[in-house]
């Protein structure tokens, strides 16, 4: 799988969707979870509704929420309120049994100033944050890592 | 692929001034800023600055507020630098640079870069 | 403005050799919302552009020889070059994307004997 790049805003939600095949998938319930370390287990944040049917109900766990779209084929997860301390690798899972198959890796990363605090198009410095709470715009910035290029930080 | 061609070398005397071009290609022109780099004969990089492809709002390094300027040509895909009133001190090779995308600003696309040399 | 100082200035080595250019900003270069050190480094042979060697002070460009290795965190950083080659012989730059201007450092002149 490769991973997906979103960046947020500090203090401000995040949207992540993971898409996949509805027929593939079909009847199975969904999961986001934590990757703890580069080869840790992968620690359940927050899952859909206990009845398939209902996972279109917004679930949440503290400040993160979960949806489901089973027909589109989409995976809705939004972090409230971003922290510097939520980024990291996650996981989007599909669950069967006590199995789950990985939908698509996240690397949620968080930018320390808000985006509309910029002209469209400017290069952004996380040294030049800024004070902002009362930003309530929602943003999320998405791409896939380079070839090569490692999700975890240096440990040295 | 992903390409930036800059314009030929320049001889200037001092006190005129010259216009630099930066013909991208492989990518969308308006997505990324284009910036600018100097190296003086024998010397280091030095960051001019950038330009916003979006809106064409220029950003310089306080070294290069001066008698340097900026400009895009979106519809070319090309971004210019001019110098005016050129100086000894100008003489330089000028690269213009991609960062991977505006929020990971390493450079991972440079032009080949324009000598501009400046003698009376 | 953050203030770069690489050392040393310049040195000759041995092909098979080992090397190790240093790197210092005047800030740290850490950011807290992603873990990562906002740090590249960029090899410029005779005659050519820069080309990016390492960024995130860590992370290999694609396609650069697993010999080249970035290291340090914070305000200190290293390239290590290990059994330096023929082909190395160029100059070296760090540079920091963490505020602007973005800086560099002055150069480390890599030479062969």
């Known amino acids: 799988h490769n991973t997906t790049v979103f960046q947020g805003v500090a203090g401000q939600s995040l949207q992540v969707s993971c898409p996949y095949d509805s027929m593939k998938h079909w009847g199975r319930r969904k999961a986001w979870c934590r990757q703890l370390g580069e080869k840790g287990p992968c620690q359940r944040v927050v899952s859909t509704h206990n009845l398939w049917l209902l996972s279109f109900l917004r679930r949440w766990n503290g400040s993160t929420a979960i949806t489901d779209d089973t027909l589109g084929g989409t995976l809705t997860i939004t972090l409230r309120n971003l922290q510097p301390h939520d980024a990291g690798l996650y996981q989007c899972q599909s669950l069967h049994g006590s199995e789950a198959d990985t939908l698509r890796k996240v690397l949620v990363e968080v930018l320390a100033d808000p985006l509309d605090h910029r002209d469209a198009g400017d290069l952004w410095f996380p040294g030049e944050s800024e004070s902002f709470e009362d930003a309530h715009v929602e943003h999320s910035i998405s791409r896939s890592l380079l070839e090569g290029e490692i999700p975890f930080p240096p440990t040295s | 692929q992903i390409q930036l061609v800059q314009s030929g070398p320049e001889l200037k005397k001092p006190g005129e001034s010259l216009k630099i071009s930066c013909k991208a290609s492989g990518y969308t022109f308006t997505d990324y800023a284009m910036q600018w780099v100097k190296q003086a004969p024998e010397k280091g990089l030095q960051y001019m600055g950038w330009?916003?492809?979006?809106?064409?709002?220029?950003t310089y390094a306080d070294d290069f507020k001066e008698r340097f300027v900026f400009s895009l040509e979106t519809s070319a895909t090309t971004a210019y630098l001019q110098i005016n009133n050129l100086k000894n001190e100008d003489m330089a090779t000028y690269f213009c640079v991609r960062s991977y995308n505006n929020y990971e600003n390493w450079f991972a696309y440079w032009g080949q870069g324009t000598l501009v040399t400046v003698s009376s | 403005d953050i203030v770069m100082t690489q050392s040393p200035s310049s040195l000759a080595v041995s092909a098979g050799e080992t090397v190790t250019i240093n790197c210092k900003s005047s800030?740290?270069?850490?950011?807290?919302?992603?873990?990562?050190?906002?740090l590249a480094w960029y090899q410029q042979k005779p005659g050519q552009s820069p080309k990016v060697l390492i960024y995130?002070?860590?992370t290999r460009q694609f396609g650069v020889p697993d010999r080249f290795i970035g290291s340090g965190s914070g305000t200190d950083f290293t390239l290590t070059i290990s059994s330096v080659q023929a082909e190395d012989l160029a100059i070296y730059y760090c540079?920091?994307?963490?505020?602007?201007?973005?800086?560099f450092g002055s150069g480390t002149k890599l030479e062969i004997k």
């Open positions: 800030q740290s270069l850490l950011y807290s919302g992603n873990q990562k050190n906002y």
């Open positions: 330009i916003n492809t979006q809106t064409g709002k220029p």
């Open positions: 540079q920091q994307y963490y505020n602007s201007p973005i800086t």
């Open positions: 995130w002070a860590s």
